[in-house]
Interface confidence: low
């Protein structure tokens, strides 16, 4: 904690102001009224504080404002928001897009993705839901952010949204994630043509049940290997090679350089070596010629 | 040893289609894809498109996919290429190329069409 | 399409040297699930066929000296001879084999100083 100490009437501060760089740190805890301070945040960016003297100002407003600080603050922070933790940042109210942007520049460059997480989460509350403007703000100025969020936070997202995600914005996106997005996605592309359709649909499919990817399957899609490597295990694994083929057009070559990779290992393992054999790809590991398939879990349901 | 082995060089007028062959022995032609690639001279490599010997199933570069068709005689472990409406610019060395995953692992020896009124 | 860029167009290195090929691509070409980057290298020695040196990246080929390195990750990659031999002298492609239609670079002739 800083030294407390009085201030020297000399040292007195009735601005913020450059002058303040000359202060130890010991003379801004004892002169900087927290009050003021919050008064005239916005000068604060200006000046090249170090990062000890900004230590000090935000245990000021710490002080100041124990339960969260208010938005007219956190708007004004700059490079001072670079010393809030996550805990910090979980007391606030955000509502204001300006201050989601102001602060996402700040962190741009900078180690945060927790802080930038927990602040994201805070205006999707503060706002209500994941609105279009927020979804704009988001993946203009922080593309991959929108995977921070929690499913459950995920789940306000309107459909009509949906529109402004761009694939880059779900690469850091999870399976639980997806889960949530996908039907949000399907909603809104459902009247699209089928190219069109899927062109939309693809960035989404990490959440697609099986009789949807059997679906697409059927459209002539040329799936890549990417996509493929991303939809859900469960997924995939009742598919037919023939679906497999239809699905991925020429890119159905591309099993042959993931046969070790899940999901397509565990589905090399479902097929009949005979129907793979047809593919030409040399893929191993299905089930020999000859061979009958026991579904016990079928059994297990009957007895 | 794996090994391609392309039919011979072409004389062709504007117009005209050419079938290039491409023979394959030392592996089993059904088990990989064929690829087609064309080099203008001096110029730089282009994939025109692949056929899978099983199926039959060719993909085919868009540029060219109104006039190529490429298929496979299983019998005789063979692929051919033909390329219709053939114009100047077409002239090149037209090599056949087997997968060995997306890559290209093995190429024929190629075959140089000219194509000249 | 994917546009591969390759550069320098033509390179000339001592006997010994080291040689160094960058190649750029459009799009990135690493898968994030494998981490595999769909990227191979081939070389054209003047007059033959071309031969593959790498694929996913940084894999040789089986028979390939190992002078030959691939390496870059995204969209950029780097083939490198760490001692050139008189018997390297060829024209070098990179290809992207992630996307259809599978693309190649311009080439980068390999000369001897």
């Known amino acids: 904690d800083v030294e407390r100490t009085t201030c020297p009437p000399e040292k007195e501060v009735h601005e913020i102001d450059e002058s303040l760089i000359f202060y130890k740190k010991r003379e801004l805890e004892a002169c900087v009224d927290a009050a003021l301070l919050a008064a005239q945040m916005d000068r604060v960016d200006a000046i090249p504080f170090t990062y000890e003297q900004l230590d000090v100002l935000k245990h000021k407003l710490d002080e100041l404002y124990p339960q969260g600080y208010p938005e007219s603050v956190i708007r004004h922070l700059g490079h001072l928001f670079l010393k809030m933790s996550p805990e910090d940042i979980r007391k606030w109210n955000v509502t204001s897009l300006e201050t989601l942007k102001a602060l996402l520049k700040v962190s741009k460059g900078h180690e945060m993705s927790a802080q930038v997480a927990t602040l994201i989460d805070r205006v999707v509350v503060g706002r209500g839901q994941l609105d279009k403007d927020t979804v704009d703000t988001l993946t203009a100025f922080c593309p991959g952010c929108l995977c921070s969020l929690s499913p459950e936070r995920l789940s306000s997202v309107p459909p009509s949204v949906i529109g402004a995600v761009r694939p880059q914005d779900l690469d850091t996106c999870g399976p639980r994630q997806l889960d949530v997005l996908y039907p949000k996605a399907r909603l809104a592309f459902q009247n699209m043509s089928g190219s069109e359709y899927f062109v939309k649909i693809r960035p989404f499919l990490g959440g697609a049940p099986t009789e949807d990817v059997k679906a697409l399957s059927q459209q002539n899609v040329s799936m890549d290997l990417a996509t493929f490597m991303k939809l859900r295990r469960e997924a995939v694994l009742p598919l037919t090679v023939a679906e497999v083929q239809k699905l991925l057009g020429p890119h159905v070559e591309g099993l042959k350089v993931e046969e070790q990779h899940s999901p397509v290992r565990d589905w090399i393992l479902k097929q009949r070596q005979d129907d793979l054999d047809t593919l030409g790809l040399g893929l191993q590991g299905g089930i020999p010629n000859g061979y009958l398939i026991l579904d016990l879990s079928v059994r297990e349901a009957l007895s | 040893e794996v090994q391609l082995v392309q039919s011979g060089a072409e004389v062709k007028k504007p117009g005209a289609s050419v079938k290039v062959s491409c023979k394959a022995s030392g592996y089993t032609f059904t088990n990989y894809w064929m690829h087609w690639v064309r080099q203008a001279p001096g110029q730089g490599l282009e994939w025109m498109g692949n056929?899978?010997?099983?199926?039959?199933?060719?993909y085919y570069n868009e540029r060219f996919m109104s006039r190529v068709t490429m298929t496979v005689d299983k019998s005789t472990s063979t692929a051919y290429m033909e390329l219709s409406s053939l114009r100047s610019e077409d002239t090149a060395v037209y090599y056949c190329?087997?997968?060995?995953?997306?890559?290209?692992?093995?190429w024929g020896q190629g075959t140089l069409v000219t194509v000249s009124s | 399409d994917i546009v591969m860029t390759q550069s320098p167009d033509s390179l000339a290195v001592s006997l010994g040297e080291r040689a160094t090929i960058n190649c750029k691509s459009s799009?990135?070409?690493?898968?994030?699930?494998?981490?595999?980057?769909?990227l191979a290298w081939y070389q054209q020695k003047p007059g033959q066929s071309p031969k593959l040196l790498i694929y996913?990246?940084?894999t040789r080929e089986s028979g390939v000296p190992d002078r030959f390195s691939g390496s870059g990750s995204g969209t950029d990659f780097t083939l490198t001879i760490s001692s050139l031999q008189a018997e390297d002298v060829a024209v070098y492609y990179c290809?992207?084999?992630?996307?259809?239609?599978?693309?190649f670079g311009g080439g980068t002739k390999v000369e001897i100083k």
């Open positions: 996913f990246a940084s």
């Open positions: 056929i899978n010997p099983s199926s039959g199933d060719s």
């Open positions: 799009q990135t070409l690493l898968n994030s699930v494998s981490q595999n980057n769909y």
């Open positions: 190329a087997r997968s060995g995953g997306l890559w290209l692992a093995f």
């Open positions: 290809q992207q084999h992630y996307r259809t239609p599978y693309t």
